[in-house]
């Protein structure tokens, strides 16, 4: 992996091997399909997604970066399991990036058309924040080989 030079990071590799990122893939695929199916939905309007309820940002702990509450009753099973898996990477931003890249690579063949791929990438980029976790400062989700800092 060019961007993060992870070859030497054995701890990250073992974390990635242990992690089950399938619930994240399922959650994201369901989400983009649900967004596509929403009749008349403006794709740029604030999310009306029942799994991501908007909350008052003033109510939350300033050190919890997301208004998404993992314990919320409205959370989907896939999202909750996904967030639990991603939680393992929270204090290693290089490893969090690698996990996101792995999700992208696993799903890239299943995405139909540029629009679906772009929407998947958008949701994936923001997945850590949706889970109330820190996002990596930089993370390239392009699946083609080569090329740094292409977003």
């Amino acid at each position: 992996r060019q961007q993060w030079e992870l070859q030497g990071d054995r701890r990250c590799q073992s974390q990635l091997e242990r992690a089950n990122l399938r619930p994240c893939e399922q959650h994201l695929m369901q989400k983009i399909q649900r967004d596509e199916d929403s009749y008349g939905r403006d794709p740029y309007s604030p999310s009306q997604d029942p799994y991501s309820p908007s909350q008052d940002p003033d109510r939350r702990d300033p050190y919890s970066p997301s208004p998404y509450d993992r314990r919320g009753a409205g959370s989907s099973q896939h999202q909750e399991r996904c967030c639990n898996e991603l939680n393992e990477f929270e204090n290693n931003q290089r490893c969090m990036c690698e996990a996101l890249q792995q999700i992208m690579e696993n799903q890239s063949d299943r995405l139909q058309g540029r629009q679906q791929e772009q929407q998947f990438k958008r949701e994936l980029r923001n997945l850590p924040q949706q889970c109330g976790l820190r996002a990596p400062q930089r993370c390239d989700l392009e699946v083609e080989s080569g090329g740094r800092d292409r977003y």
Epitope: Y44, Q93, R94, R125, R134, Q137, Y151
Partner: antibody
Framework: QVQLMESGGGVVQPGGSLRLSCAAS????????MHWVRQTPDKGLEWVAY????????DYVDSVKGRFTISRDNSNNTLYLKMTDLRPQDTAMYYC?????????WGQGTRVTVSS | DIQMTQSPSSLSASVGDKVTITCRAS??????LSWFQQKPGKAPKILIY???TLQSGVPSRFSGSGSGTHFTLTISSLQPEDFASYFC??????????FGQGTKVEVK
């Protein structure tokens, strides 16, 4: 190539209003959270506001809560900061910046001066 | 809130000198730290992110190190274009960011 261009700054009297704009290009704007940051010679850099990629939520520094509103138009790749009830201490250079995971890209800034 | 304390606030150096600037966080921020360079009248330009990762296109004389609460920016051999202000930024509490007060590198 990521480009951010702020506009809308100017001189305004205390209690007045301004709306800053930030035109974005060279990246997938609708897929990233966005920030406003300001800079003064005495206080240095201060984070001001953040908006989620899909505008579902916003965050503000305490000193501007209730006075400033961050918003975005993803169809036009534009970020906004509506500033009301402006005070002399809001005088600063205002920058827009991209959020994670594309941190580090800032615009050139637009100057806001609040003075009677 | 996390405070970022940067030192020194200014320093005088000559071309070819090794320059070290430090940034301390009031609590553990892991490696969620960036270093920026700013020249008068210009926007801040990122040099380093994730404490030690060099931004693409930035000369290799710039390097960053540290984790937790103590971080360092080193310029191994100062060049004429490096006379500028430098500041650190933490994004551990993202989307809230906090910044160091800055270090001005001047000609000796």
């Amino acid at each position: 190539q990521v480009q951010l261009m702020e506009s809308g700054g100017g001189v305004v009297q205390p209690g007045g209003s301004l709306r800053l704009s930030c035109a974005a290009s060279g990246f997938d704007f609708p897929g990233y959270g966005m920030h406003w940051v300001r800079q003064t010679p005495d206080k240095g850099l201060e984070w001001v506001a953040y908006i989620w990629y899909d505008a579902r939520s916003e965050d503000y520094v305490d000193s501007v809560k209730g006075r400033f509103t961050i918003s975005r138009d993803n169809s036009n790749n534009t970020l906004y900061l509506k500033m009301t009830d402006l005070r002399p201490q809001d005088t600063a250079m205002y920058y827009c910046a991209v959020g994670a995971p594309l941190e580090g890209y800032w615009g050139q800034g637009t100057r806001v001066t609040v003075s009677s | 809130d996390i405070q970022m304390t940067q030192s020194p606030s200014s320093l005088s150096a000559s071309v070819g000198d090794k320059v070290t600037i430090t940034c301390r966080a009031s609590q553990n921020i892991a490696d969620y730290l960036s270093w920026f360079q700013q020249k008068p009248g210009k926007a801040p330009k990122i040099l380093i992110y994730a404490a030690s990762t060099l931004q693409s296109g930035v000369p290799s004389r710039f390097s960053g190190s540290g984790s937790g609460t103590h971080f360092t920016l080193t310029i191994s051999s100062l060049q004429p274009e490096d006379f500028a202000s430098y500041f650190c930024q933490q994004s551990y509490t993202s989307p809230t960011w906090t910044f160091g007060q800055g270090t001005k590198v001047e000609v000796k």
